[in-house]
Every structure is written in structure tokens, then in C-alpha cells.
Interface confidence: low
Amino acid sequence: VLHYVVCFPALTEGYVGALHENRHGSAVQIRRRKASGDPYWAYSGAYGPEHWVTSSVSCGGRHQSPIDILDQYARVGEEYQELQLDGFDNESSNKTWMKNTGKTVAILLKDDYFVSGAGLPGRFKAEKVEFHWGHSNGSAGSEHSINGRRFPVEMQIFFYNPDDFDSFQTAISENRIIGAMAIFFQVSPRDNSALDPIIHGLKGVVHHEKETFLDPFVLRDLLPASLGSYYRYTGSLTTPPCSEIVEWIVFRRPVPISYHQLEAFYSIFTTEQQDHVKSVEYLRNNFRPQQRLHDRVVSKSAVRDSWNHDMTDFLENPLGTEASKVCSSPPIHMKVQPLNQTALQVSWSQPETIYHPPIMNYMISYSWTKNEDEKEKTFTKDSDKDLKATISHVSPDSLYLFRVQAVCRNDMRSDFSQTMLFQANTTRIFQGTRIVKTGVPTASPASSADMAPISSGSSTWTSSGIPFSFVSMATGMGPSSSGSQATVASVVTSTLLAGLGFGGGGISSFPSTVWPTRLPTAASASKQAARPVLATTEALASPGPDGDSSPTKDGEGTEEGEKDEKSESEDGEREHEEDGEKDSEKKEKSGVTHAAEERNQTEPSPTPSSPNRTAEGGHQTIPGHEQDHTAVPTDQTGGRRDAGPGLDPDMVTSTQVPPTATEEQYAGSDPKRPEMPSKKPMSRGDRFSEDSRFITVNPAEKNTSGMISRPAPGRME
């Protein structure tokens, strides 16, 4: 695990005043902040929002932001007329840049954008844009809300009065009035092409401290179509120092964004500070809990007719403003079994909990590499058919990944099932050893801006030399990345794969739009037929409480991978709970309930929960059923079938579906999901075929951040 050994005090990087005008001076500014002792803060844990007040006294003030805006109590303010925007319709210059501050992603505006009206005391100049988002699948991520309803993303544009101050930073440091606009983003079925430059930029700042210039964009296009309906109140910065100097303009109508585009936000990484160790985490749920209104009055604009237009689509219609939720827990009992030397069968069971029935069908995605070329196919299987699919033309020298997702009404999706990695025909097995690195990582060329660091959050890769050919990786690919295209292949790192018999350098993380981007090819493979292996769900224990991680700075180096957001202790308790919203977003330990029954079974004996499994080397028979005849693969380029591994064309009858993320907006709130039984350790007696290799990647609980999990005390070492 790669540790940053931090020799200076733990200090913040990313509060609202942290971005400065000279791009090339940003490192100097960061050093200056560290030297000046600006307090470290975070969105959870020991440095979370309830602790901000200890180092930033204003955070305990009575006029704090964000707030929930209750429309019925908002007074129409006659002084709040049309906003006057100047420069917003111009394309941004090529000097406009984006930065991952570790707390948000910020756009530093280099052009002149001015706003006046709306009761602002003067003509204000836009300085920067910041974003706040949730954890996955359109979950609530906005800071403000209207009538208790939150949105997947909130964009905030900050302004200062250039007539009074020479810079935004000066206005803040002198505690003088600044302006801020809050714009909600809501999921819709199509990509919003106005956001393309922003989404593209996000892919270039995946890692903390990364900066990138942005393609030209029109700032007006990032605002709601109707600017006439807005709320006004006086509040604060939503991050330390929480200065109560902000005149907020909160727009009523949201801006559309697709799930596909949302994934770019969910793919951003940060570094979290634990004592003197920094670990790489996903930057998610970067919103401050809502604050009390106290004696403040929220006003609403008096722009004529602006509040009459389609009021139902926002204030009265829950469809519009509820954060989109997953429709079920993940499909469970994932199994991949060889049928013969050239065919595999994937099977699964329906989700245990369906929040928004019915399940219409299942999407099965599988990907592989062959001759350094990666491919991926996605196909559907109707829910009333057998929950299994046959993949033919399996190549012995390819690594395969499989995962399944349920599709409900309105194309709403479940969490992803555990992902299974399979490679046939090899006698090499992985002998895991605890990998610990200290110090700053050695940089080596990154393959793309999308490369992600390995991090196990608060867990350590380990297996202490116990040979196994079946590894569970708790990557948080359940609810916390549900609906995403994030791939589990990105957690199969060069270090891990070296032990698995793979050569080659680092694996780039998989961009959220493609699953996968790159997998290593096998270094050597024998020509024996693959034998069935038990599809266990958790080969190793859950993460322990320590903060080990293995980042490679800026995605450089040979170890990249995916992990989940926040650390979590063994018993599943969070270090810190922000508010009720996060409570309701707690995830179950997906996909472990029934599969746990199988863990201590030895192959090849059939187990009660998998009655159709055959002895080693044999074909699997499915009593009373034909083989799957309804699955159609598609590839990422539009469904072209190629000669590579795939479903037998003779078996195919249904229509092709693109393997894209859901881009629809859904009704319904998120019921509190029940906690599922704890994961059991794999006993030493578990045996696996050494001629076939599976690695399962489980949907971990939201805050379980890890790859190959570190065994807790009493677990397998």
C-alpha cells in the first residue's frame, strides 16, 4: 500500500478561497496556505462539518449555508427583478482552466462575466465555478434544496465586486460581500451537449491537484433556460471559513444532465488525511449538511410570469426533483462456469430487494482482452427467462470480466452485481503478499488522464502468502457506483496481475464511459480445459480500520485502480454521519446474503444454492431449460459483432442494446436499505481449481473502500 508520509501539518486545500488567479502560481499558493496554517477540513470523519467550527468559528454562525428553501414561505421581493448578465453568452477563452482541489472541482474563469440586478449591491464579476455532487446514480448531491428536494449536482458560481476589490480573495479575506449563484443539475435522458467541455475537463482532473485547460464553453448554456424564477437569501460560504458574506441566488429550474455525464463527477478522486497518512479516495458526497434558517427571510424573484410557467414540473411534481435512486439491490449468486473448452455460462439470481418493481430485464456485460486489444459487449436477458447466459468462442488466453445489472421501469437500474474475472487454462495462481510502500511514489508515464490510483481506502492488500485462485475485491462497485460504467478491471493492477501471471505495466482506470479501457493480457497460459470453480463472494475479510492505501500521484506509475469513497470500520459503522440524507443513502453489503452459504463449500461437490453445478471438467446441464436464446451482444461502437469471444450467433434473437449508462430520470425516494448479513471469511478448506481463475469483485458497502481486503483480527491471514 502506498502511503504518503506527511511531514507537515495537515492543512486544507480546497475551501472556497483556495483557488488563485495565477495558474502557474497555484503550487506556491498551496504551500503558502500550508505554511500559514489554514485548517484542514473534510466532508466526513474527524474533520467533518460538525468539527469545522473548532478551527473556523464562523461555521457556527446563525446565517450559514446551504439551506432548504421552502417555497411557500418565500416572500416575493419586488426588488428581485431580472438578472442582467454580461459576457455570459461569449465562448470562454482557452485560458479558462479546471482544477481538482480535493474538495471540489473548480473552474477558474479567465473572461469577464458580470451579473447585476437581483438585488445585488453593484455589478459583480464571476470568479470561479464549483461543483457539489453525491455518490452515484443520480443520488442527492446538491447543497441547497427546495421543499426538501435535492438534486444530483449543484453548480455554484462565485462573484465579487471589482469596483471595491482587486480580487475575489481580497473580498473574502476582508469579509466583504460576494455573490453566488446555485444551479441544480437533474438527470434527463439525453446528454446535455452544453456540458461537454465541462465533462471533458473532468476527465483531465481525475486526481487531486490535477489541472487542465477547458475547451471553450458558453457559461449561459450552463444556466437554466429560465432565469426569471430564483430565490434570494443572505448566507455563507458552504466550506470553511464559512464567512457569512454571501448573497445567494438559487435558481428554481434545473439544468439537464445525463447519467453518462454524471459519471464524470463520480470518477473524481481526492486524498484524505488520516493522521500523517494520505489515502486516495473517491471525491463524493462533497456537500455540507443543511443549516438552519434562523431569523433569515428567503425571497423569491418578482419577475413577471416566471413562477407561473410549469410550476408543476418542479414544486408539485416529485418526479422532477427527487434524486434518482437505484431500483433494486444487485443481482446475486453470480456464477461463471465453463461449459467446455470454448464456452462459459454466466448465471445469477434476482435481487433480494426490489425498490421499484418490476424488473424488466437484465443487462449482462462482459469484457476481455486479446492481443492487447480490449473488447466489451453488453446484452439483455428478459427477466422471465432463465437467469443465465452462454458466452461462446471463449479464448484461452483472455481475461474475462462479467457483471449483471437489473433494469426496471423507465430504464431504471439496479446496483451492479459483483463482478467476476475469469481466465481459463492456467496453472499459475496468485500468492498474495502484503504490499507496503512508503514515501512519495515514483512517477512513470501515465497512459491517460483517466488513470486512477490504486487505493484500498482504509484497507491493505494482503493475503500473507496463502495461495488462492479466487480473490474478492471490495471495490465499492455496488450502490456507491451503481448505474455507472466504472469497471472492475481497473482494480486488477499490475502488482496483483504480476502475481496472477500477467506481465506488463500499469492498467489505466476505466473511464466511466467505457467498460473496460484496458486489461492486461495473459503472460502465459497452458492449454488445459478450464474447470468450474466456486463463485464465492468474499474470499477475504472486510477492511480493517487502518488507513492504508496505494495511490500513485496523478495517476502516474504502474499501479492504478478503483476504490470507493470513504473508509469504514469492520463493523460497518461510519466514522461520521453528516445528516439524515446520508443515513438514507447507506448501502447494504450487496450480493453477499445467499452467496455466503456457498463460501465454505468445497468444489466440486454441488452446493444447495447451486444445484446445477457439475463436477470438475464436465459440462453443466440445466435441468428443464434450453440454453439461452435471447441474448444479443453489442460492443461499444454500436453493436457490431466481431469474431472475438461472444455469444454464439445461433443463439441470438433479441435486439441489440447499447451498453450505456442509464440516462433517464426517475421517481421515488430511496427507502432505507436494510443491512444485509455480514461477510463471512473464507475458510482455509476452500478449494478452487487451479486451472481456472476467477476474481470476484463485490459491491462493497458504501464506505468500505478496498481492493483485496485486509483481514481483520480473527480472520484469515
Epitope: S188, R190, P224, D313
Partner: antibody, heavy 116, light 111 residues
């Protein structure tokens, strides 16, 4: 806020024709605009849309037969090679900026007749 | 291709309630909207997202959806409600997005 289509006329088959939708009261930089047609005595048929950034989407049957473009205040529909089946009233409609699949503002329509 | 099916014509007595249906194989996975079109006029949006009504549309018009059928219900039908009614939905996503209209239902108000 209003829309008005123009350019509809009698054309011979194969002669390209461009219809124009002129908008007032709102900005095309904030809305997607769609074209829908209706043959005499028939139902509505969605042709395609152009979104606020200029990206275009077409019905499967309309790809290659129609081209949608826009300026700051107008949206054009070009019928590349009209056939007699393209005889219809063509409506331009504004798509709700939030709910993509609903058109909340329509023009009165313009009639195109394709005949030899 | 994706097809929305509507009855060609429906009759209702003045003051009565009538339901117009729209079906498709996978409509349960999509949202429907409804439009009213009177002769010689442009369509008017009545319902979007299955059940939501734009401002200005009388509450006599309501939408619902069950299974693969979306329904527009007009309660207390009036002579002015005589028109063609179209359902619509979106099909596909991303670059393959398109909108689809049903064939329309001609509503006749008698009495």
C-alpha cells in the same frame, strides 16, 4: 414566447426545400427545438431536434432525408430530396428545457406540398 | 421500430368521463406525454411524464400509467374537448435518442 414556421410551398420531387422556424421571446441557446410533421388526415410524426448546443437527433426514418440547423433566432429544416410522401404540415416545437420528451410550445405549422 | 398504439376513435357523452389509452411493448419503461390537437391547429401539451400537467391545463385532464399502457383520462367531458389526442414518448438515449408519437385517437363528444 412564440414560434412561426415559414417556407412551406409547392415543390417538385427532388427539389431541396428549407423551412424556417422563427422564435421570439426566448433564446435558442437555452432550448432544444424539434420538428414534427403531419400528413393530411394523418397523425403526428417526429422528425428530429436540435439541442441548445446544436447537436442534432433524428428519427430513424428521417436520417439522411432531413437536416436541422439553427442561427441565433431561427431553426431550419432542410428536406434534402422531397418525395410526394413528404407532403405535410410541418410544425416547429420547443422542447421543455427540463423534460426532454415533451414539447410545450408549438408554431402554427407550414404546409409543404410535393407534387410533380 | 418502437410503436405506440392508440385506438383510432373514441366516443364520450357530454359530462362523462373517458379514458384514452396508449400501449407499447416496453412503455412500462418509459414516460408518456399527451397532446391535444384540434382541427387546423397546432398540438397542445396536456400531460408529460405520465401524470404531470402543465400550468393552464384544466385538472379535468389527468394521466396515469400501468404496465405497458399509458392512459389519458378526461373527466366531465365538454364539447370543446372534441379533438385528436396523441401520446408520445422517448425511445433510446444518448445519440440514439428519438421521440415517437402514437397514431392518435379522435375523440368525439356526443349529446
Amino acid at each position: 414566447q412564440s414560434l412561426e414556421e415559414s417556407g412551406g410551398r409547392l415543390v417538385t420531387p427532388g427539389t431541396p426545400l428549407t423551412l424556417t422556424c422563427t422564435v421570439s421571446g426566448f433564446s435558442l441557446s437555452s432550448y432544444a427545438m424539434g420538428w414534427v410533421r403531419q400528413a393530411p388526415g394523418k397523425g403526428l410524426e417526429w422528425i428530429g431536434i436540435i439541442d441548445s448546443r446544436g447537436s442534432t437527433y433524428y428519427a430513424t426514418w428521417a436520417k439522411g432525408r432531413f437536416t436541422i440547423s439553427k442561427t441565433s433566432t431561427t431553426v431550419d429544416l432542410k428536406i434534402t430530396s422531397p418525395t410526394t410522401e413528404d407532403t405535410a404540415t410541418y410544425f416547429c416545437a420547443r422542447e421543455d428545457s427540463y423534460y426532454y420528451d415533451s414539447f410545450n410550445l408549438w408554431g402554427p405549422g407550414t404546409l409543404v406540398t410535393v407534387s410533380s | 421500430s418502437f410503436v405506440l398504439t392508440q385506438p383510432a376513435s373514441v366516443q364520450v357523452n357530454l359530462g362523462q368521463t373517458v379514458s384514452l389509452t396508449c400501449t407499447a411493448d416496453t412503455l412500462s419503461r418509459r414516460y408518456a406525454s399527451w397532446y391535444q390537437q384540434k382541427p387546423g391547429q397546432a398540438p397542445v401539451l396536456l400531460i408529460y411524464r405520465d401524470t404531470s400537467r402543465p400550468s393552464g391545463v384544466p385538472d379535468r385532464f389527468s394521466g396515469s400509467s400501468s404496465g405497458n399502457t399509458a392512459t389519458l383520462t378526461i373527466s366531465g367531458a365538454q364539447a370543446g374537448d372534441e379533438a385528436d389526442y396523441y401520446c408520445a414518448t422517448s425511445d433510446g438515449s444518448g445519440s440514439s435518442y428519438q421521440c415517437v408519437f402514437g397514431g392518435g385517437t379522435q375523440l368525439t363528444v356526443t349529446g
